[in-house]
């Protein structure tokens, strides 16, 4: 299991530090959830061959996963601290229908599913304390949710393997974008 | 075993130019993110620069934008910090370090970094 954000890695010649700014926390948050992630891959790889399904292939889904686009502001041309940190805690809250789904998909990496679930809830109020403009966030709707993972569940082993490991790659994608982001805040 | 070793530190006037070196050995460049950091006399340890191998994604601290370019050869694992216009405030002891992270996202932070060199030498002064 990757380190829990705030123990320290094998450093060489590292540096002692100060205790982390806000801005550091929530980098390291996300890094924690992508190391969980990237455990999670490896099983997800292991059991089936959706790693090795091509992109085009992987795209005719209906999922509404969040992904980043230029009007969200997050990338290096047009970036707007204000209206990506909007973008990012909206997806961020988009994605926990789709990490509650991946609950129950996991045999040997179960604990990390968990672990990947609850630290997105941490990293979101973390980056709601740093957002000014609140109002400007739409949570999803809980009925809505519900329904979805209702039909997400209800579908074969084959298109549910293919929904995980969606959710992952997507997942995945998101956090990488947020953290190049975040660096320019 | 992981060795980051840097090189191509020195005495330069102000406005000059210097190339730093960092030679990985113990693994392979291919899938992380390489930073270079600075650390003054008294100060905390800054990131510079950034480069990952993934998607080339690169990273510049404000104060060097314009001046410094990174860059990465896989083929002989090496890493170099060209650092041109430099200022007395660029002195620093500069370090690289490694995050071997699979997902290779720059960081200005020193807390993902699993591995540093020892440092080498900048001093800008006339």
């Known amino acids: 299991a990757p380190v829990p954000p705030g123990e320290d890695s094998k450093d060489v010649a590292a540096p002692h530090r100060q205790p982390l700014t806000s801005s550091e926390r929530i980098d390291k948050q996300i890094r924690y959830i992508l190391d969980g992630i990237s455990a999670l891959r490896k099983e997800t790889c292991n059991k089936s061959n959706m790693c090795e399904s091509s992109k085009e292939a992987l795209a005719e889904n209906n999922l509404n996963l969040p992904k980043m686009a230029e009007k969200d502001g997050c990338f290096q041309s047009g970036f707007n601290e204000e209206t990506c940190l909007v973008k990012i805690i909206t997806g961020l809250l988009e994605f926990e229908v789709y990490l509650e789904y991946l609950q129950n998909r996991f045999e040997s990496s179960e604990e990390q599913a968990r672990a990947v679930q609850m630290s997105t809830k941490v990293l979101i109020q973390f980056l709601q304390k740093k957002a000014k403009n609140l109002d400007a966030i739409t949570t999803p709707d809980p009925t809505t949710n519900a329904s979805l993972l209702t039909k997400l569940q209800a579908q074969n082993q084959w298109l549910q393997d293919m929904t995980t490991h969606l959710i992952l790659r997507s997942f995945k994608e998101f956090l990488q974008s947020s953290l190049r982001a975040l660096r320019q805040m | 075993q992981v060795q980051l070793v840097e090189s191509g530190g020195g005495l330069v006037q102000p406005g000059g130019s210097l190339r730093l070196s960092c030679a990985a050995s113990g693994f392979t460049l291919d899938d992380s993110a390489i930073g270079w950091f600075r650390q003054a006399p008294g100060k905390e340890r800054e990131g510079v620069s950034c480069?990952?191998?993934?998607?080339?994604?690169?990273y510049y601290d404000d104060s060097v934008k314009g001046r410094f370019t990174i860059s990465r050869d896989n083929v002989k694992n090496m890493v170099y910090l060209q650092m041109n216009s430099l200022k007395p405030e660029d002195t620093a002891v500069y370090f690289c370090?490694?995050?071997?992270?699979?997902?290779?996202?720059?960081?200005?932070?020193?807390?993902?970094?699993?591995?540093w060199g020892q440092g080498t030498q900048v001093t800008v002064s006339s």
């Open positions: 370090a490694i995050d071997l992270s699979d997902y290779g996202v720059c960081s200005k932070w020193p807390s993902p970094y699993d591995y």
């Open positions: 480069i990952s191998s993934s998607d080339g994604d690169t």
